[in-house]
């Protein structure tokens, strides 16, 4: 019996087609992805093949103005239109709190939404009961397939699930659910979830009875043969893991942003054992037509976005200096504003010992592309912020050793004075440079804001200590020459859309007046 699994993950609000790098589509003839194009390909495959499941491994939420405006309603609407069969909850599905998941998505989705390792307690337990499930048994042709969901147990540090959801260890939570499916005579089981490729492989290895793992969170690109675009494969598709009980378990992921549609064909024997598996992600490039009816629907929904872009988010009573002349040479108040917003967006009081789990922000000055003049009645719009942060990036959470941070700050000024983008703006950090010293030895003082303290204060950076830092995904990926971050980071979790982070902060503060306050000094 053959099953075709079509899968997406980490779509992050890319409902419209995008450029090759998943930013805003500029030249339509070169654009990719988007739900209209995805629908075309899904329908083609459904037409051609008998037993097809369309699955999503989480993080549909967050990433573009679509999510900012529609807050998940767009996800439910278009996933329903594409007739998804199941979805796993990702960490970003909790970005607007549990209510922001329940109302727009859980109550509106016409497909099951899954996670076996999230347990509700207290008053939420009855409110959310039945709205998401640990597993679902789906009829596929003449057979049944069990889908069991999982979500990163780090979600409380990455999003806003509140205090009434407990995120258990994935493997511990999955095993009893898989066992239950077995007792129900379900012998073909897919683990669908959002914990990253390393956990996907562990699940394949450790959870008895799981036949296939369809994952997300780490934006992993797997491919067999010559890859069709810029993404470099982390391994073959599918990635085969030998389980502890000796089975070959295919593990797949399909990069991110709706650029690819994962396509996996699995052959099962009559006892539900995987005999063979093959496939590849399908690049959704512009040679795949956008479905006209879905496209028309997208255009209808788009109207509200254009209106939103010009509405006032808040006011500034000071000039927001985002000029290259400032942000690439010294502390600039636009950099301070953005870093403050980044920290504010990551306030998660998850432990009595810590006032927060993260206190530090770094931001490449070259990523700040425009100032905002306060003389326009102080008005700040999404449109203004899009000029400041035009690249459609995210502000991510990483864990780094102090020694890596020191290298990053040395890199920040290694060729100071040439208006290069690597000069770092900061939050929760006090740095002093001595430019008379040779490159690689210019950081004379580096103090960081404590987290394990009731009264935050600045302490000298410790080389061997592991620190959490919020930074643009561009830096996490080694951009602007920050190879040391990419090479030495100990953990990397994708965060929220950059503009969304700053816009939310401005809306919250209502009136802003960021200052230049001595975060960066030169001796």
């Amino acid at each position: 019996w053959e099953l075709t699994i079509l899968h997406t993950n980490d779509v992050h609000s890319r409902l419209e087609q995008t450029s090759e790098d998943s930013s805003k589509c500029v030249n339509a003839s070169r654009c990719m992805g988007g739900v209209a194009r995805l629908f075309t390909k899904v329908q083609q495959i459904r037409r051609a093949e008998p037993n097809v499941l369309l699955l999503d491994a989480g993080d549909q939420y967050q990433g573009t103005i679509w999510f900012t405006v529609y807050k998940g309603a767009e996800v439910a609407h278009f996933m329903n239109a594409l007739r998804y069969d199941a979805m796993a909850l990702g960490n970003h599905e909790f970005d607007n709190g549990v209510e922001g998941l329940i109302e727009p998505l859980l109550k509106e989705a016409k497909f099951p939404i899954l996670s076996a390792n999230i347990k509700a307690k207290g008053p939420l337990a009855s409110q959310i009961s039945g709205l998401y499930l640990p597993y679902k048994v789906l009829p596929v042709g003449d057979e049944v397939v069990g889908i069991v969901g999982y979500t990163s147990k780090e979600t409380p540090f990455l999003s806003n699930p509140g205090t009434n959801l407990v995120f258990e260890d994935e493997i511990t939570a999955l095993q009893p659910e898989v066992d239950k499916l077995k007792t129900l005579n379900v012998n073909k089981i897919i683990a669908l979830g959002h914990s990253g490729f390393e956990m996907d492989k562990l699940i394949a290895q450790k959870v008895r009875g799981v036949d296939v793992v369809v994952g997300g969170h780490s934006n992993t690109f797997l491919y067999t043969g010559n890859p069709p675009s810029k993404e470099v494969p982390a391994g073959k598709y599918p990635f085969i893991v030998t389980s502890d009980d000796g089975r070959k378990v295919p593990v797949v992921q399909a990069y991110a942003f709706g650029k690819y549609l994962g396509y996996l064909k699995i052959e099962f024997d009559e006892r539900g054992n995987v005999i063979s598996s093959h496939g590849n992600p399908i690049l959704l490039n512009s040679s795949i037509p956008e479905d006209p009816s879905i496209k028309a629907d997208i255009n209808k929904w788009r109207i509200k976005l254009d209106n939103y872009s010009t509405q006032e988010l808040g006011k500034t009573i000071v000039y927001l200096d985002g000029s290259s002349q400032s942000c690439r040479f010294r502390e600039c108040n636009m950099g301070n504003l953005i870093c403050d917003a980044m920290i504010n967006n990551n306030l998660r009081h998850t432990d009595e010992m810590f006032w927060n789990h993260v206190s530090m922000c770094i931001l490449n000055g070259g990523g700040i592309r425009s100032p905002i003049d306060e003389r326009n009645n102080g008005t700040i719009t999404w449109e203004n912020l899009a000029a400041v942060l035009p690249f459609g990036g995210t502000f991510d959470l990483v864990q780094l050793k102090g020694s890596t941070l020191k290298k990053a700050f040395e890199h920040s000024v290694h060729r100071y004075g040439q208006s290069t983008g690597e000069f770092l703006q900061v939050g929760g950090i006090h740095v002093v440079y001595d430019l008379s010293r040779k490159p690689g030895d210019r950081v004379v003082k580096l103090d960081v804001l404590c987290t394990k303290c009731r009264v935050p204060s600045y302490d000298p950076l410790k080389m061997d200590e592991v620190y959490k830092v919020i930074l643009p995904n561009f830096l996490a990926n080694g951009g602007d020459g920050f190879q040391m971050i990419k090479d030495e980071l100990l953990r990397h979790d994708s965060g929220d859309q950059d503009i969304n982070v700053v816009s939310t902060y401005i809306s919250k503060m209502k009136v802003i007046y960021p200052a230049v306050e001595g975060r960066i000094k030169f001796s």
Partner: antibody
Framework: QVQLVQSGAEVKKPGSSVKVSCKAS????????LSWVRQAPGQGLEWMGE????????YYNEKFKGRVTITADESTSTAYMELSSLRSEDTAVYYC??????????????WGAGTTVTVSS | DIVMTQSPDSLAVSLGERATINCKAS??????VAWYQQKPGQPPKLLIY???YRYSGVPDRFSGSGSGTDFTLTISSLQAEDVAVYYC?????????FGGGTKLEIK
């Protein structure tokens, strides 16, 4: 290389049936769709229907109202098109053509050489 | 059924000159349009798929454009071997339908 080799010309009486074959080679037969397209003398092209050999799923042009049946034999990588209740206006060249539904070439990328079917009393 | 209306029915162009063939769909077919070249006694040959993508091995003097309902095949500099009948076809909805064809000749 990809080849679609069709059976030879046929002369048929009105009311009878014809079965044309199309043997595929040079690619994985079950991973592509196969369509049948006909062309009456001096006329344009007309799509009759298609089959996806991997699933056996078939789709037909309503115009042929149950007269056409498309089948596929995986073991020999051969597709067949049977047209029944033949009439003189069914005189045409019948082509099989491959369709890459997993790829991005929206069109028929390989064609058979065609089979001439003449319907005459 | 989606009707594909091709124009002109026939076209005579001098060698080295540009030839343009149009195709209009009766409803929005996105970019799901292919163009074929057919010479006497031969099966059609795929030239352009998805409205504007040149099929492998097709000379770059052939180009396609359009989306929605209006599509164009252009031969930038006509060669003697381009004499043939050209067909557009929509691949958006079954039954897949072809235009009536355009006979291209040398003037």
């Amino acid at each position: 290389q990809v080849q679609l080799v069709q059976s030879g010309a046929e002369v048929k009486k009105p009311g009878s049936s014809v079965k044309v074959s199309c043997k595929a080679s040079g690619y994985t037969f079950t991973s592509y769709g196969l369509s049948w397209v006909r062309q009456a003398p001096g006329q344009g092209l007309e799509w009759m229907g298609e089959i996806y050999p991997g699933s056996g799923n078939t789709y037909y042009n309503e115009k042929f109202k149950g007269r056409v049946t498309i089948t596929a034999d995986e073991s020999t990588s051969t597709a067949y098109m049977e047209l029944s209740s033949l009439r003189s206006e069914d005189t045409a060249v019948y082509y099989c053509a491959r369709y890459d539904y997993l790829g991005s070439s929206y069109g028929f990328d390989y064609w058979g050489a065609g089979t001439t079917v003449t319907v005459s009393s | 059924d989606i009707v594909m209306t091709q124009s002109p029915d026939s076209l005579a162009v001098s060698l080295g000159e540009r030839a343009t063939i149009n195709c209009k769909a009766s409803q929005d077919v996105s970019t799901a349009v292919a163009w074929y070249q057919q010479k006497p006694g031969q099966p059609p040959k795929l030239l352009i798929y998805s409205a504007s993508y040149r099929y492998s091995g097709v000379p770059d003097r052939f180009s396609g454009s359009g989306s929605g309902t209006d599509f164009t095949l252009t031969i930038s500099s006509l060669q003697a071997e381009d004499v043939a009948v050209y067909y557009c076809q929509q691949h958006y909805n079954t039954p897949y339908t072809f235009g009536g064809g355009t006979k291209l000749e040398i003037k």
